[in-house]
């Protein structure tokens, strides 16, 4: 006997009560492949999740996170809270970065200022906890009539303006 | 491939007590901290406890000191967690995983590995 359930198409389900009619997936839920023996129940984005595609009978529906928060996991299957810049998730919740290192984003870590000196440069703007240092020329760079031959003047390190 | 797979949760009455377990596979286990962290249904991700590779050291959030209690067996390749006097607020989906780093109570999540979650709910 041919099994009559490979027929059913995505979006329908292969009912053994109905002599292996395909019936269609019933409301919230769905078959992404054909030849299902049951629909799978859809996803519901709610609390801290928020819809941004909504469950049809071929497909399952797709969650986000609402403001304030960003997905973590596959399919977003958790949310994360965001931090402000100048701050990095700790385990207990946002912490300001710590002296000599900053985060420009809402997420991630605290990651330490460049260090202008290891390219032989100087500290043109300091860094705060917010943004990076910029580096710039030396001053033997700026100094003049300085030739390439001019060994560079020993630059500053990266500094912290007050908050 | 590196995966972690929980199991344990459910249904359970206010009072009552669930133990968790995560079975690891695909990396060396002995040689990382691990966490439990969870999603409770209406706000963000949420770290819960923390125990550093040898099962020396434990963390936890000041929500669940004293009543929940992680613990490791690195011959078993499983993590544990031991909740007791389990309240409303626990219901959540809860996670294990794999730390990159030391696995203090304060570090960043220095998360590498999640795995599935498992649901827990606490009702009566």
């Known amino acids: 006997l041919q099994d009559l359930c490979s027929n059913c198409p995505a979006g329908t389900f292969c009912d053994n009560n109905r002599s292996q009619i395909c019936s269609p997936c019933p409301p919230n839920s769905f078959s992404s492949a054909g030849g299902q023996r049951t629909c799978d129940i859809c996803r519901q984005c709610k609390g801290v999740f928020k819809t941004r595609k909504e469950c049809s009978s071929t497909s399952n529906a797709e969650c986000d996170c609402i403001s304030g928060y960003h997905c973590l996991g596959a399919e977003c299957s958790m949310c994360e809270q965001d931090c402000k810049q100048g701050q990095e998730l700790t385990k207990k919740g946002c912490k300001d970065c710590c002296f000599g290192t900053f985060n420009d984003q809402k997420r991630g870590i605290c990651r330490p200022w460049t260090n202008c000196s290891l390219d032989g440069k100087s500290v043109l703007v300091n860094g705060t906890k917010e943004r990076d240092v910029v580096c710039g020329p030396s001053p033997a760079d700026l100094s003049p009539g300085a030739s390439s031959a001019t060994p560079p003047a020993p630059a500053r390190e990266p500094g912290h303006s007050p908050q | 491939e590196v995966q972690l797979l929980e199991s344990g949760g459910g249904l359970v009455q206010p009072g009552g007590s669930l133990r968790l377990s995560c079975a690891a596979s695909g990396f060396t286990f002995s040689n990382y901290a691990m966490s439990w962290f969870r999603q409770p249904p209406e706000t963000g991700l949420k770290w819960v406890s923390s125990?550093?590779?040898?099962?020396?050291?434990?963390y936890y959030a000041d929500s669940v000191k004293g009543r929940f209690t992680i613990s490791r067996d690195n011959s078993k390749n499983t993590l544990y967690l031991q909740m007791n006097s389990l309240r409303a607020e626990d219901t959540a989906v809860y996670y294990c995983?794999?730390?990159?780093?030391?696995?203090?109570?304060?570090?960043?999540?220095?998360?590498?590995?999640w795995g599935q979650g498992t649901t827990v709910t606490v009702s009566s």
């Open positions: 995983a794999k730390e990159g780093s030391h696995g203090t109570d304060d570090s960043h999540y220095d998360v590498d590995v």
């Open positions: 125990i550093d590779a040898s099962g020396g050291d434990t």
